[in-house]
């Protein structure tokens, strides 16, 4: 659910880390209405996810670790 590159809501699905190549943080105080994590998938889709949810934090942590180890 995004409009002009802003997420307007969150996915109600859970994604596997193997499906995700990267993410972008959306901050509510930078021109968008809500905080969000935008996951970029291997199918070239952008998925808006709730940064408070455990599965989202888990994937963000995994991807951040990967970047650190590069």
């Amino acid at each position: 659910a995004s409009n002009f590159d802003c997420c307007l809501g969150y996915t109600d699905r859970i994604l596997h880390p193997k499906f995700i190549v990267g993410f972008t943080r959306q901050l509510a105080n930078e021109g968008c209405d809500i905080n969000a994590i935008i996951f970029h998938t291997k199918k070239k889709l952008s998925v808006c996810a709730n940064p408070k949810q455990t599965w989202v934090k888990y994937i963000v942590r995994l991807l951040s670790k990967k970047v650190k180890n590069m």
Partner: antibody
Framework: QVQLVQSGAEVKKPGASVKVSCKAS????????MHWVRQAPGQGLEWMGV????????TYNQKFKGKATLTVDTSTSTAYMELSSLRSEDTAVYYC?????????????WGQGTLVTVSS | DIQMTQSPSSLSASVGDRVTITCGAS??????LNWYQRKPGKAPKLLIY???NLADGVPSRFSGSGSGRDYTLTISSLQPEDFATYYC?????????FGQGTKLEIK
Amino acid sequence: QVQLVQSGAEVKKPGASVKVSCKASGYTFTNYWMHWVRQAPGQGLEWMGVIDPSDSYTTYNQKFKGKATLTVDTSTSTAYMELSSLRSEDTAVYYCTRGNYGVDYAMDYWGQGTLVTVSS
Amino acid sequence: DIQMTQSPSSLSASVGDRVTITCGASENIYGALNWYQRKPGKAPKLLIYGATNLADGVPSRFSGSGSGRDYTLTISSLQPEDFATYYCQNVLITPYTFGQGTKLEIK
């Protein structure tokens, strides 16, 4: 050791509701998801939905939206699955199963199953 | 939703045989696949996670392989306790979906 102990078999009339419990022990309840899976007679396994006990976030298989409600009581490390407006096709064995994203999102421990029979 | 198709749906084999069960996804699931064993009257048991990784306590005669849309469970030398029904499961994205099962019977 990890254990998931489910409530006993239930026989219900069509239109009634049933609430199945799943008591977890041997691990930190809030660190793992709890999935619910069913197997109807002569059928395969069917994923119903999942709850994250740390924040009660749920997501459901579309087929079970409005039919199943997943909840948890973290004080007793118990997960619940309530089925409403029961019909004969809801007759099945219902399993709770721990979701472990440390092992590739697999369901690594299962309850013994609860048979729900819907019959008039 | 992602569809999972197993073959064969049933299979007769003898103790000591090498057995292969295949699972096909309706789209690429990038190795997000698990295998379970279910015996009558018992809860399913995790065998393989992440397409290739053996779960704790599972004998090494079980192995998993595959990528993309096509996956395989192999039992290198069947033992009497292996006669059961086997299910593959997609965990790429909810709703998680299972194959219809492969029933392994004694010949």
